[in-house]
């Protein structure tokens, strides 16, 4: 997480006050467990993760527990409830299924050990949306230049399976990146709202890597990249007549 630290004052200052956090990683400079990330892949569930490296070698720290509260109405619910599921999202995590998740209210979470709070954060679900990677990447040839040196391709993909695109619950924007296989720096294309995009002027004698990632439009952060799609453009002699491509 980055941004200002949330403390118990969050809940006492005003019943609906909320300090927002960025879901990005935060370096754990202290010796106590810290939240590292909260993420919702599809606005219907979310999970939070924390560090626990030092904890293994520290005798005076008790078991780490996560508690949460959400502002359901008029005031923050005064009771903190314990994490509903420590298992489904892996080690040092808490998973909130769809019954516990709504984008329409703010949440606060805290990590405790021996009854004391060691870290605390507040957020709304939309701020922590990071979609799963796009899937089923493929490409087709659009055309080849008259010189036979360059070619244009169309790259297509599908939204992650758990993203409810049809009902408009998620509106994803996509970022495509590509590079020659032996290069280190990726070329970035402008974000788009469609699931296909042309890539122009690729060299026909080179092999390219293409990857795509997505984010919820107007909120959240980019998710992980898709698996890399390899694009090999054969030499000009392997193509049929140039005229066929125009």
């Amino acid at each position: 997480f980055s941004g200002s630290e949330a403390t118990a004052a969050i809940l006492s200052r005003a019943p609906w006050s909320l300090q927002s956090v960025n879901p990005g990683l935060k370096t754990n400079s202290s010796k106590e467990p810290k939240f590292t990330k909260c993420r919702s892949p599809e606005r219907e569930t979310f999970s939070c993760h924390w560090t626990d490296e030092v904890h293994h070698g520290t005798k005076n720290l008790g078991p780490i527990q996560l508690f949460y509260t959400r502002r359901n109405t008029q005031e923050w619910t005064q009771e903190w409830k314990e994490c509903p599921d420590y298992v489904s999202a892996g080690e040092n995590s808490c998973y909130f299924n769809s019954s516990f998740t709504s984008i329409w209210i703010p949440y606060c979470i805290k990590l405790t050990s021996n009854g004391g709070t060691v870290d605390e954060k507040c957020f709304s679900v939309d701020e922590i949306v990071q979609p799963d990677p796009p899937i089923a990447l493929n490409w087709t040839l659009l055309n080849v230049s008259l010189t036979g040196i360059h070619a244009d391709i169309q790259v297509r993909w599908e939204a992650p399976r758990n993203a409810d695109i049809q009902k408009g619950w998620m509106v994803l924007e996509y970022e495509l990146q590509y590079k020659e296989v032996n290069e280190t720096k990726w070329k970035m294309m402008d974000p788009i709202l469609t699931t296909s995009v042309p890539v122009y002027s690729l060299k026909v004698d080179k092999e390219y890597e293409v990857r795509v990632r997505s984010k919820q439009r107007n909120s959240g952060n980019y998710g992980e990249f898709s698996e890399v799609l390899y694009v090999t453009l054969p030499q000009m002699s392997q193509f049929t007549c140039e005229e066929d491509f125009y």
């Epitope: 200052r13 609906w16 006050s17 909320l18 502002r71 008029q74 329409w104 709304s124 619950w169 107007n218």
Partner: antibody, heavy 115, light 108 residues
Amino acid sequence: EVQLVESGGGLVKPGGSLRLSCAASGFTFSDAWMDWVRQAPGKGLEWVAEIRSKANNHATYYAESVKGRFTISRDDSKNTLYLQMNSLKTEDTAVYYCTLFRDYWGQGTLVTVSS
Amino acid sequence: EIVLTQSPGTLSLSPGERATLSCTATSSVSSSYLNWYQQKPGQAPRLLIYSTSNLASGIPDRFSGSGSGTDFTLTISRLEPEDFAVYYCHQYHRFTPTFGGGTKVEIK
């Protein structure tokens, strides 16, 4: 005590514009998530729009029926919520309520769209 | 969106009687995110119950709520004269927040 007082309603022709205001007091306005909810004459309640706090980047949300025509905004220094309504239609005729988290409600202001 | 259907549309009862109001959702709503409101003529809605069964501040305990999934109920154990009003259910779980069409509780 939470108080929400709406103003700015009135009679407007179809295609016209109107800006509603909601003066808030009795709570920390800058921390609050605020909504507009409307009620057509003799009908039920319809959620219109929401704006979140500065801590939440003043994120805004709209009902499909008003998206692209209405804009919710706020001035935290004045403890005031706004609803800018453009391209008004006859079906926008309603009492517009300003609400805090849809828990506390103002008394509403009537908007009539008619030629 | 999740559509909330309230029944009956109108409930005609006498003071002292028990009122049972129903709210049915087109898809499952977590009990944490369902509220009930009361509205009297010429007044703004007032929050009665939040999270299906919790009484809002200042609401008398003759009001109670229950339910889960797609079926929710508001019960008024003994109707007082001031309880005759329109009642709305409201969900803020998935999609955009929606309200039911309302149930009018009138004096018989």
